[in-house]
């Protein structure tokens, strides 16, 4: 009988397979409490019960059973603030990035039965409870309705709603994607007395139309009002209605600041300050001027007044206002002063305290790093995230500033908690930050924990991904490095994913993964097991991600370098990085590829067509090919207008089509979903046309009826399998 051969544990580990990735075998969990008070929260359990937790009494019980959820096939829920009712959401039907329609049922927790009579219509576009009591506001067929109680008949607040024409309380396509980043455009006042909403009038916006093939004999046409660069934009108006007696005064329009209303403009956000004070943010179409306007209710007038001395202007002289979006204010308890992130004199985004005017703002944070988000302002503390710690732009730590102290003292809440495992955090706070949850995304396994808001003491581990940890024990994961390289006066951070048995003396194929869009960040200290992890683990490919000029959180000089000239430095910096990687000695110069999706598809295409001979092949998924084809709000923010007297010349010079000839010496795989509402198939159609006209050979794949995410299971499997084959062929790797 042969003796058993001892194998060291390392050898028993297997490489990742593509199947692992496609099946989501190694996906992680996070735990975000659904806060309902200072010390209570709800959470949906693994078996779909909605469970109530009280941190202080340690009480927990099922508030809504999975059988009730199941009875209407509910996938989500929302508890009314008076805790008498729960809405149950079912028939989820995705529309665009954030928007979806659904059917809603109201369950009476007191009676233990569904509310009958005056049931909600279907499908509803958006629904929410008032912050107090159990009033309901909802949007149906582009109009807003109000219920004083769930069993009451509805009151119709707006009558102007029309499909693809006028949207009340929900954004149109461009505002949803490029400005609000939400599915809603209505906001309750803190006491539930007022409801503010936006009306978007798209009547004059050009329509993008594309075929949806479905299963029918004839395809149907999807029509979306979609303003491309330079086109007519939505006309926006903001209204506030008194929800106690909405039939008396009706919707009251909030005036637009004069300096904004004098030319094309955008509404950018609304923040309730108190029950009778609201803060609106506006932006000029040329997005370098933002105005924050504080408005007060005048009972005697039945009107909202926005005095000029309550207008605060934020202007950028080197680029656009804000980061990706203009930041929103975090108001103090006094309902007058607020904290806000904007660029300081050195061009780094920092927290400022505004008491009266922006000119007199007090800078709260400073340094050659950036404050990223203000989570919560309480009586004595301000919680924010930044990338200050140890100078890594791709980290996120949570800080607390004690604003009661003079001078304010700063403490990093997360920096030393689990230093190796956790360098990228977000947080979720209870109402007045009495407690908070921390969610760490990496670089190690994600972990969610509960903390005391006064002492920052960890109370409980909510989710630590033990199962995932166990299942990864026998997997050969690649090694991940985050480092920086220097070129001239520039510093570029990069992430390198190295095959498990990486040996610096050997040569490896290199794949660059690029996004590179303005104010984006790819080099982040987060955990991931995805396609590129597999390529490194199983196929022995070195992967690199590089944050070049135009990317975020490293100051405005770096960020605004791409202003009005997209497609230049983003590409140049990827090429610079590739040359530096070659110099490191372990890259096979004959086997270098680049791939990207969306903006990354644009950059990868331009990099392939750079004429440098650095790349053997590359892939562009759903690329932008011309900024004239993309949404006005996005394109114009970074490129200005495509007019002769503005920036038409660079709009024309920066297209992928203009470089068609340069694809002759690379293998190019172009991929796009035909039902892409975001980056229209038109973009790839025009690249293909230009390549054909130039008689350049290339490969292409379309995904019928798939949108910008190519998300359907079958399509994703096909997509990643197809890209894997293409890369392995390019790198001469055997199957």
């Amino acid at each position: 009988r042969p003796s058993r051969v001892y194998k060291p544990e390392g050898n028993t580990k297997r490489a990742l397979t593509l199947k692992d990735i496609l099946n989501g075998t190694f996906s992680y969990k996070t735990y975000f409490p659904n806060w309902i008070s200072e010390q209570e929260y709800l959470h949906q359990s693994e078996d779909d019960n909605i469970v109530f937790y009280n941190i202080e009494t340690r009480e927990s019980y099922i508030i809504l059973s999975n059988s009730t959820m199941k009875s209407v096939n509910a996938t989500d829920y929302g508890l009314s603030p008076d805790r008498q009712f729960v809405y149950l959401e079912s028939d989820y039907s995705k529309l665009w990035r954030y928007s979806y329609t659904a059917t809603y049922y109201i369950y009476d927790l007191q009676n233990g039965e569904f509310v009958r009579g005056y049931e909600l219509p279907r499908p509803i576009q958006y629904l929410c409870w008032s912050p107090v009591g159990s009033k309901l506001a909802y949007v149906y067929q582009n109009n807003i309705y109000l219920k004083q109680r769930p069993g009451d008949p509805p009151f119709q607040i707006t009558y102007t709603g029309r499909e693809n024409r006028i949207f009340n309380g929900i954004p149109d396509w461009v505002y949803e994607e490029e400005m609000l980043a939400t599915k809603y455009a209505l906001w309750w006042s803190p006491d539930g007395k007022f409801l503010a909403y936006v009306e978007f009038n798209d009547s004059d916006i050009p329509i993008i139309a594309y075929s949806y093939y479905g299963d029918g004999q004839y395809p149907r046409t999807i029509n979306i009002p979609y303003p491309k660069a330079g086109a007519k934009n939505p006309v926006v108006r903001v209204f506030i209605v008194d929800t106690t007696y909405p039939h008396h005064v009706g919707p009251m329009e909030v005036p637009v600041p004069e300096m904004i209303a004098s030319s094309d403009y955008y509404f950018s956000w609304l923040t309730w300050v108190s029950s009778e004070r609201v803060c609106l943010q506006w932006l000029k179409r040329v997005q370098n001027v933002s105005v924050l306007s504080i408005c007060d209710f005048r009972e005697d007038w039945h009107a909202w007044e926005c005095p000029k001395n309550q207008e605060h202007v934020e202007e950028s002289r080197t680029g656009w206002a804000g980061g990706f979006f203009v930041s929103t204010p975090a108001f103090s308890q006094d309902a007058t002063s607020y904290y806000k992130i904007f660029s300081d004199k050195d061009g780094y985004k920092h927290i400022h305290y505004i008491k009266d005017t922006v000119e007199n703002a007090i800078q709260i944070t400073s340094g050659k790093w950036e404050a990223i988000y203000i989570f919560r302002v309480t009586q004595d503390s301000l919680f924010y995230s930044s990338n200050e710690f140890e100078g890594y732009p791709g980290r996120r730590n949570i800080y607390r500033i004690s604003i009661g102290n003079s001078p304010p003292s700063k403490k990093c809440v997360t920096c030393h908690l689990r230093k190796e495992r956790c360098q990228y955090y977000t947080a979720s706070f209870s109402y007045k930050a009495k407690y908070y949850a921390l969610v760490c995304y990496g670089p190690g396994l994600p972990i969610s924990t509960l903390h005391d808001g006064r002492t920052d003491q960890e109370i409980q581990v909510l989710e630590e991904n033990k199962e995932l940890e166990n299942s990864l024990r026998n997997i050969q994961l690649p090694k991940v490095e985050i480092k920086k390289l220097k070129d001239g006066g520039l510093t570029f951070w990069y992430k390198m994913i190295l095959p498990p048995q990486f040996d610096r003396s050997k040569k490896y194929p290199l794949l660059i993964q690029v996004y590179g869009g303005p104010c984006s960040q790819s080099v982040k200290s987060v955990f991931a097991v995805n396609w590129i992890t597999y390529l490194a683990s199983k196929e022995g490919i070195v992967i690199a991600l590089v944050d070049g000029r135009g990317t975020a959180f490293q100051g405005d000089k770096f960020l605004h370098a791409v202003y009005r000239k997209l497609g230049v430095y983003e590409v140049e910096d990827q090429l610079t990085a590739v040359r530096k990687f070659i110099e490191m000695g372990f890259i096979d110069e004959e086997r270098i590829a680049i791939w990207g999706w969306s903006y990354g598809g644009y950059v990868s295409s331009l990099a392939l067509a750079s004429g440098t001979g650095l790349f053997k092949c590359g892939i562009a998924v759903a690329p932008v090919s011309s900024w004239e084809y993309y949404a006005s709000i996005y394109s114009e923010r970074f490129m200005g207008l495509p007019t002769k007297d503005d920036n038409l010349e660079h709009y024309k010079n920066s297209t992928v089509m203009a470089r068609a000839e340069y694809f002759r010496n690379v293998d190019y795989l172009l991929i796009h979903g035909t039902a892409d509402d975001n980056v229209h198939f038109q973009n790839s159609a025009q690249i293909a046309k230009a390549l054909v006209n130039a008689q350049v050979d290339f490969q292409a794949m379309w995904y019928s009826d798939q949108n910008h995410g190519i998300l359907s299971g079958r399509s994703q499997n096909h997509l990643y399998t197809h890209m894997t084959h293409f890369l392995k062929q390019c790198f001469s790797l055997s199957d």
Partner: antibody, heavy 117, light 108 residues
Framework: EVQLLESGGGLVQPGGSLRLSCAAS????????MSWVRQAPGKGLEWVSA????????YYADSVKGRFTISRDNSKNTLYLQMNSLRAEDTAVYYC??????????WGQGTLVTVSS | EIVLTQSPGTLSLSPGERATLSCRAS???????LAWYQQKPGQAPRLLIY???SRATGIPDRFSGSGSGTDFTLTISRLEPEDFAVYYC?????????FGQGTKVEIK
């Protein structure tokens, strides 16, 4: 306190037109939603039309839709009701009232419109 | 449209007596949207009650409103001589806003 004063009523033949005005005192007229309510002789009250504040959205009773037009001139603090294709059944006292669809808290004294041949 | 039916059509009472006026809706009305008006001959209507139970400015506390859903009531606890008039209920729940046909409170 808001004061409302209607004018423009009178005798008109069927098919004819009339324009009613309602002058409002108070500097914040532009923010008020306003309505026209009528009362046929010896009968009850009937809502005719409404216009929202600065938004200027308009609403009509089915009985007058397509014939009557409500409008406002906020610079003149005045509400109007343009009545075309008048019928005998439009004979009534026309009141302007402050309010959108209800809680009509201020009313004018009314102006009589008589449609007769 | 929502039809409001008031009863009785006429109520004959003496000063000092209690008057109870009823208003029934053809479909449910949230109490927020129900109002009562008083109208005297040759005068414009006057808002008495809004939100089914809240008194308008300057309205004496002998006037009170109650009810929900489809049944609403206006009560005048002790009739004063100036209270003899026609009373209308009105809903603003739905367009078109509608009024009841009125209840006449007359001196017995």
């Amino acid at each position: 306190e808001v004061q409302l004063l209607e004018s423009g009523g009178g005798l008109v033949q069927p098919g004819g037109s009339l324009r009613l005005s309602c002058a409002a005192s108070g500097s914040t007229f532009s923010s008020y939603a306003m309505s026209w309510v009528r009362q046929a002789p010896g009968k009850g009250l009937e809502w005719v039309s409404a216009i929202s504040g600065s938004a200027g959205y308009t609403y009509y009773a089915d009985s007058v839709k397509g014939r009557f037009t409500i409008s406002r001139d906020n610079s003149k603090n005045t509400l109007y009701l343009q009545m075309n294709s008048l019928r005998a059944e439009d004979t009534a006292v026309y009141y302007c009232a402050k309010g959108w669809f209800g809680n009509f808290d201020y009313w004018g004294q009314g102006t009589l419109v008589t449609v007769s041949s | 449209e929502i039809v409001l039916t008031q009863s009785p059509g006429t109520l004959s009472l003496s000063p000092g007596e209690r008057a109870t006026l009823s208003c029934r809706a053809s479909q449910s009305v949230s109490s927020s949207y129900l109002a009562w008006y008083q109208q005297k001959p040759g005068q414009a209507p006057r808002l008495l009650i809004y939100g089914a139970s809240s008194r308008a400015t300057g309205i004496p506390d002998r006037f009170s409103g109650s009810g929900s859903g489809t049944d609403f009531t206006l009560t005048i606890s002790r009739l004063e001589p100036e209270d003899f008039a026609v009373y209308y209920c009105q809903q603003g729940q739905q367009i078109p806003p509608t009024f009841g046909q009125g209840t006449k409170v007359e001196i017995k």
